[in-house]
Interface confidence: medium
């Protein structure tokens, strides 16, 4: 960056090179060029010469003042006009940053995705800080009192093999950057209570032409968890509102769920599960489409899911919005 140039003088920022966004700041430039009494000192921000708010302090020093500085990053350098020099002479440069101290991390959530071998911890970091912010995740065994710390810039995957202190832990997150440090509340977890079953997947659908035609949705999960609760939501693609069917189930074989649907309409289905009575749900499965026939029976399988229509409902696997106990708002 600009900080690597050879300087013929000195540039500094008050109150600091990293400061709170919206502050008034002063950038000072002091020339130390051999055989040069600068006629003028110039300031450049991101390569563009500044014209205003420049004050000459003495023969070698000038100050540039910014009110309410709102740019997250800027490269500053200053130059001197020396007598008998055709071009301006570079004095020095500095990268400056503005941002915010971190908010208190909240909604700390730790889950173990079945078969992953990891405990994944996420949190709501709050407002954007604009500057480099690090997070230290503290994991303390309630049985051995031993504490481990993990440094990260977003979420953290902790190998379950490294959790040797029994089943009960306290987890909390410290957020720190150049402008401040905050600490979350402590989350108490029991490893057996935070397992999210292996993803449930809808494999196919068929409509049986009985007296009242019925659609059977086939779905499954590779979970080894014995008692699982699932929700299947479905709607016509033209509708806004989801209908929800709930299941207490075990996946010893492929699940078959019956629906009585309107003929000749395209429906979309999704499923998600949790260990029965536990806190965290899987994200919703990817969208599965099935068009009910006018009369003739029809089968739709995963292999023929060519639709690219996606209303943004497919959820990333670490979306904290889907990992809370109070996350029912999206199933209306």
């Amino acid at each position: 960056g600009i900080t690597n140039i050879n300087c013929s003088g000195h540039i500094w920022v008050e109150p600091a090179t990293i400061f709170k966004m919206g502050m008034n700041i002063s950038i000072y430039c002091q020339a130390a060029i051999k055989n040069c009494q600068p006629r003028k000192l110039h300031f450049y921000k991101n390569g563009i010469k500044e014209r205003f708010q420049i004050t000459r302090i003495n023969k070698t020093t000038a100050r540039l003042w910014y009110k309410n500085f709102l740019e997250p990053h800027a490269s500053m350098y200053c130059t001197a006009e020396c007598p008998k020099h055709f071009q301006e002479t570079l004095i020095c440069g500095k990268d400056i940053s503005s941002g915010y101290p971190p908010d208190i991390p909240d909604e700390v959530t730790c889950v173990i995705y079945e078969y992953s071998g990891n405990m994944t911890c996420t949190w709501n970091a709050g407002k954007l800080t604009y500057i480099d912010t690090k997070y230290v995740v503290h994991v303390k065994s309630l049985e051995t009192e031993e504490e481990q710390q993990y440094l990260t810039s977003s979420y953290i995957n902790i190998s379950t093999d490294s959790l040797q202190g029994g089943k009960k832990y306290l987890v909390w997150v410290q957020a720190a950057n150049a402008l401040g440090m905050e600490e979350s509340k402590q989350l108490q977890i029991h490893l057996d209570d935070i397992v999210i079953p292996s993803a449930a997947v809808i494999s196919r659908a068929e409509t049986i032409n009985a007296t009242v035609p019925k659609t059977i949705i086939y779905w499954d999960s590779q979970t080894t968890i014995e008692k699982v609760s699932c929700e299947m939501r479905y709607k016509a693609t033209t509708n806004q509102t989801w209908n929800v069917k709930e299941f207490d189930t075990n996946f010893t074989y492929v699940q078959q769920s019956e629906f009585y649907l309107e003929p000749n309409i395209k429906y979309v289905f999704q499923v998600r599960c949790q260990e029965t009575g536990k806190r965290y749900w899987q994200p919703w499965s990817s969208l599965f489409f099935h068009k009910t026939p006018e009369t003739v029976p029809q089968v739709t399988s995963k292999a023929f899911q060519h639709d690219t229509w996606n209303s943004g409902l497919t959820v990333a696997s670490i979306s904290t919005g889907h990992l809370t106990s109070d996350n029912r708002g999206d199933i209306g």
Epitope: S229, E246, D248, N250, S257, G277, D326, G329, I331, G332
Partner: antibody, heavy 119, light 107 residues
Framework: DVQLQESGAELVKPGASVKLSCKSF????????INWMKQRPGQGLEWIGW????????NYNEKFKGKATLTADKSSSTAYMHLTSLTSEDSAVYFC????????????WGTGTTLTVSS | DIQMTQSHKFLSTSVGDRITITCKAS??????VAWYQQKSGQSPKLLIY???TRHTGVPDRFTGSGSGTDYTLTISNVQAEDLALYYC?????????FGAGTKLELK
């Protein structure tokens, strides 16, 4: 002791509406679904629907959509069921019951409210 | 919706007897069956869930069993306080549905 206390008996005229209440004691109201059941003499129990007080989300039995509306007030730890366009068919004992989210069996039941619809 | 059928509306018993109450589901409910006891003028009380898991505080004379579509509640050494109405309920899927009930009465 965990308790669900329901409002007293109601006598209403056909066509009217009524709001039944279910107040919870001694547990975290926002962590459990509150379900409502209808029991008519000799006709067993019917599930009406649930509300999750934490978010206000509801799910209804198709049979009771348009008849029952479920709400909850977190500040008073009370769940409500509003029944509209009442007929003699709605005369029954109504129970609220708690279930752990993600299960469909009911571990704590309310005291029950007798609703009589008669002119 | 899944239908739950309790074939006996009434069952007669004596104190100390062993009695079995049956319940049949209209489709496989993979052991997701609960049993409730309701005494006259009272609200139902959960006895059993997942076909055989006894709820907290329920005496061990109450036993649930079954799989597929057929389920039973057995009361061994019937006590006078067990005379009540017993309902089965499938908790496999929504809407949860109940049987019509079996009334246990004295011979």
């Amino acid at each position: 002791d965990v308790q669900l206390q329901e409002s007293g008996a109601e006598l209403v005229k056909p066509g009217a509406s009524v709001k039944l209440s279910c107040k919870s004691f001694d547990y975290t109201f926002t962590s459990f679904d509150i379900n409502w059941m209808k029991q008519r003499p000799g006709q067993g129990l019917e599930w009406i629907g649930w509300i999750f007080p934490g978010s206000g989300t509801t799910n209804y039995n198709e049979k009771f959509k348009g008849k029952a509306t479920l709400t909850a007030d977190k500040s008073s730890s009370t769940a409500y069921m509003h029944l509209t366009s009442l007929t003699s068919e709605d005369s029954a004992v109504y129970f609220c019951a708690r279930r752990l989210t993600g299960t469909r069996y009911f571990d704590v039941w309310g005291t029950g409210t007798t609703l009589t619809v008669s002119s | 919706d899944i239908q739950m059928t309790q074939s006996h509306k009434f069952l007669s018993t004596s104190v100390g007897d062993r009695i079995t109450i049956t319940c049949k589901a209209s489709q496989d409910v993979i052991t997701a069956v609960a049993w409730y006891q309701q005494k006259s003028g009272q609200s139902p009380k959960l006895l059993i869930y997942w076909a055989s898991t006894r709820h907290t505080g329920v005496p061990d004379r109450f036993t649930g069993s079954g799989s597929g579509t057929d389920y039973t509640l057995t009361i061994s050494n019937v006590q006078a306080e067990d005379l009540a109405l017993y309902y089965c309920q499938q908790h496999y899927t929504t809407p949860p549905t109940f049987g019509a009930g079996t009334k246990l009465e004295l011979k």
